[in-house]
């Protein structure tokens, strides 16, 4: 049978030929009659065999990390017969390890983030080195980790590569650290190989700083003309923290006048002082308010850093603005009776300069030929007024400062022209009536109504009468209906077209004004030739028919 021990060849042997071991048949008596052969991958190129002795040699430098075993086949032949002495057999050559690989950190680059002020012992990151040598071969791949840079803030566990905090760190002093870790194989014994890696450790922020005003006093100004909501200036606190931990909120701590407000610009972290109520230089020309600032987000466990909010004082000076004249009222309504003579008094408007210098005021009326105003604000008429032409006047009165004519204010003034009874009532329309020759007494000829151009205080009431002459000799009579209308009736039987073709009746209409006014109005009545039934359709009075729009036969 075959005789051999397990074959080992050390890696990285530089000799041209390294004896690995000997293969032999127990039938080999050493008389050189046997021939040994090596077959398989590596035979002849990596390994050779002495055909006579069966000694195997490695003729190539081997790398265990590349390939750690070779399976070869061996044959032994009797030279004299050419026959196999032993059956072909497989054998294994193992490549034994030497410490020729340094530890390598394959997961580089390393970066870790840990909160500032973390307590001692806090885990930061684990670094792991790999050693290509054989972990089962002595200590060639057994590693020890140590810290080359990073004391006194960090430490590394020698066997695990776990980096921990060994001293509290303040991000506001230093926000990142470079730690250098060394891994040594052979558990650090002589002849060990080493590799290093750098770990960038960044400190994340915790809210351990409150915002603080750098200025204890701010001086701001606001124009008295500024509308509410105006930004009048900014204040700024500083927080050494970053991001969300530096977000702050400003607020008013003291403002007795409740005139100002502070809003926070969360992009710039500035406080914007806002005008909440209009200011008036003449009323108060300076203010003092106190503002405070605190962080927007504060964790419960960090409240100890935020016990007392930082404050600052803000002095606000009101700037005087030359303001336009100010009328006592926003508008005026005056009344004047119609028909009062030119120059009559209408009313007085009054404006003053609100500023301290109290400039005299001049008044004017925009585009009016009917009214005038003097420097005292007295409005008078320049013409007699007729309510029936215009019952209201809308005036625009302008007040101008004498010392600064650009300072102008205008207000509306409404003048109501009051009614006097200066118009008598009159027919509401032109009336032309007719009567049949054969009309009987008491026949209704016409209903009339009246109008009065005057304004009625309560309600117009008109009184209708015939004139004295007509009352005495009239063929007609009038009845007042007591509702501002009256009816005209025949006062006799029968009329003669040839003798009296037309009657002109004078009607008096009086109003209920004080004093009462009366007008005389003429009613024209035509006499018509009518048929027996009294139908006006057959009235043959040509001129009348034409005037009434009838066609004559």
């Amino acid at each position: 049978g075959w005789v051999w021990n397990q074959f080992f060849v050390p890696e990285e042997m530089n000799t041209t030929s390294h004896h690995v071991g000997r293969l032999r048949s127990d039938l080999d008596n050493g008389n050189n009659s046997f021939q040994y052969k090596l077959l398989g991958a590596g035979a002849g190129s990596t390994f050779i065999i002495d055909e006579r002795t069966g000694d195997i040699y490695a003729i190539e430098k081997l790398d265990r990390e590349e390939r750690s075993l070779y399976i070869l086949r061996a044959q032994v032949i009797d030279i004299t017969t050419g026959r196999a002495v032993e059956p072909e057999s497989e054998f294994v050559i193992k490549v034994s390890d030497i410490n020729d690989n340094e530890p390598k950190f394959l997961d580089e680059p390393y970066e870790a983030i840990v909160p500032e002020m973390s307590p001692e012992g806090t885990l930061v990151i684990q670094v792991t080195a790999s050693d290509a040598d054989d972990p089962s071969s002595g200590n060639n791949a057994r590693l020890l980790y140590s810290l080359l840079q990073g004391q006194p803030y960090f430490s590394v566990e020698p066997t695990t590569g776990v980096i921990r905090i060994s001293s509290k760190m303040d991000r506001e002093l230093q926000d990142e650290y470079w730690v250098i870790i060394q891994a040594k194989d052979m558990i650090g014994q002589p002849g060990a190989l080493s590799g290093t890696t750098s770990v960038l450790i960044k400190l994340s922020d915790v809210n351990d700083n409150k915002p603080i005003f750098k200025e204890s006093l701010y001086r701001l100004t606001v124009s008295e003309s500024a509308p509410t909501g105006t930004s009048i200036g900014t204040i700024m606190a500083y927080d050494n923290d970053i991001g969300e931990n530096a977000e702050m909120d400003y607020s008013i701590e003291e403002d007795d006048s409740q005139t100002f407000d502070i809003i926070t610009n969360h992009e710039t972290q500035e406080g914007i002082v806002i005008l909440k109520k209009k200011v008036n230089f003449e009323h108060q020309n300076h203010y003092g308010i106190r503002a405070k600032v605190k962080n927007h987000h504060v964790d419960e466990q960090l409240m100890k850093y935020h016990t007392e909010a930082s404050t600052t004082f803000i002095k606000i000076q009101v700037e005087d603005v030359d303001e336009p004249p100010l009328f006592l009222l926003p508008y005026y309504i005056f009344e004047i009776f119609e028909e009062t003579p030119q120059g009559s008094f209408v009313g007085v408007v009054s404006a003053t300069d609100p500023d301290n210098r109290k400039s005299p005021i001049r008044y004017s009326i925009t585009r009016s030929k009917v009214f005038n105003i003097d420097d005292n604000g007295t409005i008078t008429t320049t013409n007699s007024l007729d309510r029936e032409i215009s019952a209201w006047y809308n005036l625009s009165i302008t007040a101008t400062e004498k010392y600064n004519i650009e300072q102008i204010s205008s207000i509306p003034v409404y003048v109501q022209v009051l009614n006097i009874n200066d118009h008598a009532p009159e027919f509401s329309q032109y009336y032309e009536s007719y009567v049949c020759e054969n009309a009987g007494s008491g026949q209704v000829i016409q209903t009339i109504s009246a109008v009065d151009r005057d304004e009625s205080i309560e309600e117009h009431h008109f009184y209708f009468n015939l004139s004295v002459e007509d009352t005495n000799s009239s063929s007609f009579t009038i009845i007042d209906n007591q509702d501002n209308t009256a009816v005209i009736l025949t006062n006799r039987t029968g009329f003669n077209l040839q003798e009296e073709p037309i009657f002109y009746i004078s009607i008096l209409i009086a109003d209920n004004g004080i004093p009462s006014l009366t007008s005389t109005n003429t009613l024209t009545i035509h006499v018509c030739d009518c048929d027996d039934s009294g139908s006006t359709q057959t009235c043959q009075y040509q001129e009348l028919m034409l005037s009434m729009g009838f066609k004559t036969e």
Partner: antibody, heavy 120, light 108 residues
Framework: QVQLQESGPGLVKPSQTLSLTCTVS??????????WSWIRQHPGKGLEWIGY???????YYNPSLKSRVTISVDTSKNQFSLKLSSVTAADTAVYYC????????????WGQGTLVTVSS | EIVLTQSPGTLSLSPGERATLSCRAS???????LAWYQQKPGQAPRLLIY???SRATGIPDRFSGSGSGTDFTLTISRLEPEDFAVYYC?????????FGGGTKLEIK
């Protein structure tokens, strides 16, 4: 797990050099115990081993192609490459990259393959 | 170079049947150095068996390998529809590495 992906031109002119790259993901090319190999398959035919490389740069080639083949490795990019010079139409094939277990010689895993056509 | 000869070139069987594929080496090959692969159209080969008889990760137990020296066999005990493909053997016992010509397993 380890994955391999071939890349390179799909068309090469005769007499020129075919160049392919295999990118390894999910593991390091610098791991011991593995060769990184190229295999090709002519259309409708069997598989032919071209050669392999260890991360140290040591190469092993098929003697039938040795004069024209160069395999190289870039451990920083986790890639290895194949160059085949003086190509002819007979080099038209699907080219695969694969990982080889150095002690026992089996291929696992494989890339999905890339067809290279040699034509003018 | 070791030449691997696979037989039959084509094998026609039905699902549920047993398939026996042969791989013969021109020289003796260590069983540690013989592997089998499956290849479906348009796909890369997939490792089935290594060391002549060890199943690769995720390979169903209906696949088995055997043999030594120069004669090696791949057996599929009960064919499933997804098993119809081309099968290759490969050796590492002698340089250069070589593959067999393949056996096409088709549905009957």
């Amino acid at each position: 797990q380890v994955q391999l992906q071939e890349s390179g031109p799909g068309l090469v002119k005769p007499s020129q050099t075919l160049s392919l790259t295999c990118t390894v993901s999910g593991g390091s090319i610098s791991s011991g115990g593995y060769y990184w190999s190229w295999i090709r398959q002519h259309p409708g035919k069997g598989l032919e081993w071209i050669g392999y490389i260890f991360y140290s740069g040591r190469t092993y080639y098929n003697p039938s192609l040795k004069s024209r083949v160069t395999i190289s490795v870039d451990t920083s990019k986790n890639q290895f490459s194949l160059k085949l010079s003086s190509v002819t139409a007979a080099d038209t094939a699907v080219y695969y990259c694969a990982r080889v277990y150095s002690n026992y010689g089996w291929f696992d895993p494989w890339g999905q393959g890339t067809l290279v056509t040699v034509s003018s | 170079e070791i030449v691997l000869t696979q037989s039959p070139g084509t094998l026609s069987l039905s699902p549920g049947e047993r398939a026996t594929l042969s791989c013969r080496a021109s020289q003796s090959v260590s069983s540690s150095y013989l592997a089998w692969y499956q290849q479906k159209p348009g796909q890369a080969p997939r490792l089935l068996i290594y060391g002549a008889s060890s199943r690769a990760t995720g390979i169903p137990d209906r696949f088995s390998g055997s043999g030594s020296g120069t004669d090696f066999t791949l057996t599929i005990s009960r064919l499933e529809p997804e098993d119809f493909a081309v099968y290759y053997c490969q050796q590492y016992g002698s340089s250069p590495l070589t593959f067999g010509g393949g056996t096409k397993l088709e549905i009957k």
